[in-house]
């Protein structure tokens, strides 16, 4: 048993069938010595009585809040959650796994850039007594520090007969230099609880590995005399590292045509410009990614050809 | 992903075009050696991320943009002596600065250098055959070393006696190689800021 | 005492359909993972399909995806297997079994597909 | 498909020592918790093994397990006459987890 925060313990459970559970011993926080009795949730039958209070915990009944009286008046509570441990492995059921980019990833993160902030999400299908919290730092042995935010709920999706829930939290890396050269990772840490199960999820991973910049802005055609070419070209997403002559970038221009099935035609530049082919009912794309770390390509951004 | 193969203009920054040809080197070195080591823990997750020229060189602060001078969090800079005079600096106005930056990058190019042809000598003797250096690599770190011209003292290959312990050498190369790749895409973007300024 | 009865075995022919039933006593079983495993005459055991405790997700092995489906009813404490499309390679006797540290396992049910 | 790999057989007379291996790699046994079961012929797999070297109650002391890197190994010291049976490791992927993988089987057989 720990102590996630003040009053409230996980007790972690080896969890099978017919499990012996975890013993427990309950201690009011009150100078009285004498007359205290037990109680578990909204239940006014008496548990035991005395300052402290043993219990075989097995399964969820045998959470809850536990609270210690005094002729009628409440002396403390203890809220104990269950921490689920299946065939040595911690449990998750309150989390969907992605499975991007591999099995078993429950939380994805990116970063727009190279300044120490980043954004981690993750879903769920519950919609209720649901609370996350989020704790980061780069490395584990030593950390340094990464400050989080709350987590919010972002989005939410109907998939199928579910509704899926997403949850987000930014992250600020406390003193981050763009051009350093990571060695140790970022960790991300994340505390759910749904009623009275508790669950952790951790990813680890370099800034550089996460990095997915903005689309490029500005895109615009610029038509060429007397042909079917036009000059497409579009600058740096404004959220994106400086300078960008040491940040660069790479591009790629697409042309599609308004069918999926049609060829695309797609070039690849390092300059913020590109000459292609306009076809009829076409539309020119333009994604970027690292010039020089292949880490994600951005999102595309488009202008139709007519 | 390969990076496009860049055809340097007359005028343009010398070694622009070497850094580039090493990074898409040592990139394609790295992605042979995590197929081939594939039962080796190789990949960035399961390797410890060691930097050997860590307290020797200062590539990352002496090669600051200008415009990150000012990040308090870039400028834990260590003391650091080198030689400064080199042909990549093609300009009088070359300040001590990037004179300094190009000789930390020199000196990165030889200490890796020196500890990939150790690492070499000992996996030509692996009885397996499973991998070796590309030797495209080695010639595009010297290639770049001569486009930089420093004269420094030669660092002695490594000569070891006791029998090599492949498994660790072949872990230590993929430590090696993931630590290369970091430090060429610096390396390249330095070229690149250079050539821009 | 955890208990875990199976039925519904039997000979079936190739490409039709059967239904294994799992019934379980003795703990609460809604709040328990559960597996089937099967084992072919002579042969080594071989992992089927696993579902949540709360049904909410189910894991198949390659070998029967899309022609065997895992499902539970956690008001009739059973678990079942679904199978459709049999082959001869279906053969086996089939366990059903708690997912956890210590495990408890069904007597088995053989089927048999042949024509 | 079996990823773990032990011996098809083994033997030993009563009284000896008899190990079974089972190999596997970094995303199974390097990364999960090794289990054995004891298969006596017509029967339901019995645990004798969890959590790589624990003994659940019942299971007699001469049953006992390691693991060491990707491989797990179960010894049974001063072998008897009613140990003669198939024996299977079992383990997880980290990526497929919680699909059971299991051992390809190792028949035990007392000589004497």
């Known amino acids: 048993i720990w102590e996630l925060k003040k009053d409230v313990y996980v007790v972690e459970l080896d969890w099978y069938p017919d499990a012996p559970g975890e013993m427990v011993v309950l201690t009011c926080d009150t100078p009285e010595e004498d007359g205290i009795t037990w109680t578990l949730d909204q239940s006014s039958e008496v548990l035991g009585s005395g300052k402290t209070l043993t219990i075989q915990v097995k399964e969820f009944g045998d959470a809850g809040q536990y609270t210690c009286h005094k002729g009628g008046e409440v002396l403390s509570h203890s809220l104990l959650l269950l921490h689920k441990k299946e065939d040595g492995i911690w449990s998750t059921d309150i989390l969907k796994d992605q499975k991007e980019p591999k099995n078993k990833t429950f939380l994805r993160c990116e970063a727009k850039n190279y300044s120490g902030r980043f954004t981690c999400w993750w879903l769920t299908t519950i919609s209720t007594d649901l609370t996350f919290s989020v704790k980061s730092s780069r490395g584990s042995s030593d950390p340094q520090g990464v400050t989080c935010g709350a987590a919010t709920l972002s989005a939410e999706r109907v998939r199928g007969d579910n509704k899926e829930y997403e949850y987000s939290v930014e992250c600020q890396e406390d003193s981050a230099c763009p051009a350093a050269e990571e060695s140790l990772p970022i960790e991300v840490m994340v505390d759910a609880v749904h009623k009275l199960k508790y669950e952790n999820y951790t990813s680890s991973f370099f800034i550089r590995d996460i990095i997915k910049p903005d689309p490029p802005k500005n895109l615009q055609l610029k038509p060429l005399k007397n042909s079917r070419q036009v000059e497409v070209s579009w600058e740096y997403p404004d959220t994106w590292s400086t300078p960008h002559s040491y940040f660069s970038l790479t591009f790629c221009v697409q042309v599609q045509g308004k069918s999926k099935r049609e060829k695309k035609d797609r070039v690849f530049t390092d300059k913020t410009s590109a000459t292609v082919i306009c076809r009829k009912n076409a539309s020119i794309s333009v994604r970027a990614q690292d010039r020089y770390y292949s880490s994600s390509w951005s999102e595309w951004a488009s202008v139709p050809c007519s | 992903r390969n990076l496009p193969v860049a055809t340097p203009d007359p005028g343009m920054f010398p070694c622009l075009h070497h850094s580039q040809n090493l990074l898409r080197a040592v990139s394609n070195m790295l992605q042979k050696a995590r197929q081939t080591l594939e039962f080796y823990p190789c990949t960035s997750e399961e390797i410890d991320h060691e930097d050997i020229t860590k307290d020797k060189t200062s590539t990352v602060e002496a090669c600051l943009p200008l415009e990150l001078t000012k990040n308090e969090s870039c400028l834990n800079s260590r003391e650091t002596s080198f030689i400064t005079n080199g042909s990549c600096l093609a300009s009088r106005k070359t300040s001590f600065m990037m004179a300094l930056c190009l000789s930390s990058i020199y000196e990165d190019l030889k200490m890796y250098q020196v500890e990939f042809k150790t690492m070499n000598a000992k996996l030509l003797m692996d009885p397996k055959r499973q991998i070796f250096l590309d030797q495209n690599m080695l010639a595009v770190i010297d290639e770049l070393m001569q486009a930089l011209n420093f004269n420094s003292e030669t660092v002695p290959q490594k000569s070891s006696l006791e029998e090599p312990d492949f498994y660790k050498t072949k872990i230590k190369l993929c430590i090696l190689l993931h630590a290369f790749r970091i430090r060429a895409v610096t390396i390249d973007r330095v070229m690149s800021y250079l050539n821009a300024s | 005492q955890v208990q875990l009865v199976q039925s519904g075995g039997g000979v079936v022919q190739p490409g039709r359909s059967l239904r294994l039933s799992c019934a379980a006593s003795?703990?609460?079983?809604?709040?328990?993972?559960m597996h089937w495993v099967r084992q072919a005459p002579g042969k080594g055991l071989e992992w089927v399909a696993f579902?949540?405790?709360?049904?909410?997700?189910?894991y198949y092995a390659d070998s029967v995806k899309g022609r065997f489906t895992i499902s539970r009813d956690n008001s009739k404490n059973t678990l079942y297997l679904q199978m459709k499309s049999l082959r001869a390679e279906d053969t086996a006797v089939y366990y059903c079994?708690?997912?956890?540290?210590?495990?408890?396992w069904g007597q088995g049910t053989m089927v048999t597909v042949s024509s | 498909s079996y990823v773990l790999t032990q011996p098809p057989s083994v033997s030993g007379t009563p009284g000896q020592r008899v190990t079974i291996s089972c190999s596997g790699g970094?995303?199974?046994?390097?990364?999960?918790?090794v289990k054995w079961y004891q298969q006596l012929p017509g029967t339901a797999p019995k645990l004798l093994i969890y959590m790589n070297d624990q003994r659940p109650s019942g299971v007699p002391d001469r049953f006992s397990g390691s693991k060491s890197g990707t491989s797990a190994s179960l010894a049974i010291t001063g072998v008897q006459a009613e140990d003669e049976a198939d024996y299977y490791c079992q383990s997880y992927d980290r990526g497929t987890h919680p699909a059971l993988l299991f051992g390809t089987g190792t028949k035990v057989t007392v000589l004497g």
């Open positions: 079994k708690t997912h956890g540290s210590h495990d408890n």
């Open positions: 579902i949540r405790y709360d049904g909410s997700n189910k």
């Open positions: 970094r995303s199974n046994i390097g990364s999960n918790t």
């Open positions: 003795g703990f609460t079983f809604s709040s328990y993972g």
